[in-house]
């Protein structure tokens, strides 16, 4: 060390940490999910942890069953409070089929467009919540690869409720939903025993989503 070295009081540089994410939540709203307000409670608990705004995190929600509906776009609301009010009002649209590939593909192709509020250069995150094997699983591999090609980080949540209530094997279902999640799977895949248990994963899911902001 140079003999002229001096210790001076200095201010540490501001930590450069992007607080911007574009998050699209893809919700299975098919008939098997009950009670639906467990899903809206999950949304509420997750969204209230977010700092939502046009220069911060943006959230859009897509619901699917047989068809896909854009509940609201990424740029629709400019505060956490507004998003919470809107999310609470989301009704279960139903459907006898679970078209998960269609839901994910629609989110990628439509929800993540600039027209719907996606921002250039901002990290894209998709959260997929479903309670059953997809009826269009032959399309899933390609749809997931398309998301991968567009650098969309995916968190997937398997609700085992209808399987457990029906005493059905969850093995195939869990494998499918794991395949949707980004790598490493153990950090991006969640499963819950039933709809009521969705709220129990919010803290961990939130932390893992926010960890992306720092990368």
């Amino acid at each position: 060390v140079s003999p002229t070295f001096q210790v001076v009081n200095s201010i540490a540089p501001v930590q450069e940490c992007s607080t911007q994410l574009d998050i699209v939540i893809v919700l299975d709203g098919s008939n098997s999910i009950y009670p639906w307000d467990s899903v809206t409670a999950f949304l509420n608990d997750l969204l209230e942890r977010m700092d939502i705004g046009p220069k911060q995190t943006q959230v859009g929600i897509v619901q699917y069953g047989e068809n896909v509906t854009h509940e609201f776009n990424l740029n629709k609301y400019s505060s956490t409070e507004e998003v919470l009010v809107a999310a609470k009002k989301i009704v279960q649209r139903g459907g006898r089929q679970t078209m998960t590939a269609l839901g994910i593909d629609t989110a990628r192709k439509e929800a993540f467009t600039e027209a719907r509020g996606a921002r250039r250069g901002v990290k894209k995150v998709m959260v997929i919540v479903t309670d059953g094997e997809s009826h269009d699983n032959h399309r899933l591999k390609k749809v997931i690869q398309d998301c991968e090609d567009e650098n969309i980080q995916r968190f997937s949540i398997a609700i085992l409720g209808s399987y457990n209530r029906g005493n059905l094997s969850t093995e195939k279902f869990v494998e499918e939903i794991k395949s949707i999640a980004s790598e490493p799977t153990e950090k991006h895949f969640f499963n819950v025993s039933d709809e009521l248990a969705l709220v129990t994963i919010v803290k961990t899911l939130g932390e893992r989503i926010f960890a992306l902001e720092a990368t």
Partner: antibody, heavy 124, light 108 residues
Amino acid sequence: QVQLQQSGPGLVKPSETLSLTCTVSGASISSYYWSWIRQPAGKGLEWIGRIYASGSTNYNPSLKSRVTMSVDTSKSQFSLNLSSVTAADTAVYYCAREGWERLQDYYYYGLDVWGQGTTVTVSS
Amino acid sequence: EIVLTQSPGTLSLSPGERATLSCRASQSVSRNYLAWNQQKPGQAPRLLIYGASSRATGIPDRFSGSGSGTDFTLTISRLEPEDFAVYYCQQYGSSPLTFGGGTKVEIK
């Protein structure tokens, strides 16, 4: 057929905890959500909350701070604890099943099977 | 929470007559998850109708339910002596589950 058999004390002292148990027969406890409902004499019905076999719960916000539900799948039983009771908690307490069926689609029936009811009086 | 308002409070009718009971919700009931229950003195409620219009197992076809959204109706086409009781509507589409105040169907 499905039967729900309720048990527990009929008299509870003020400030103590009311504890009731419901034993399920004729149906798998893991296949349904299970609810507790109460009805003060001559009045209407009030839903207390629900529980699933995993232990997941959902309580009525009006009672949430005092309610605890639990389940013992090995005994096919689920239970209700209501703490810090007052005379206002005097009522007939019912357990019930939230029915569902998968035919060509999923059908949810609401509270389709009820226990016989337990009259609980809060008094010193 | 969804508030359910039943009318009339009491319905005085004779056996053989038609009974029409109304239930109005303060907001739309999700997926029309509305049930009708019958309760007789000293007994637990009994499910009659689920999903607004489907009859529960073993319920006679003189009982029918209709309506959607916020307005629901239970109709008993021809009252039998055993039908005189209190009827409650109940929504199970959102938590907390809520019940109407009840309609008492009494013998005129």
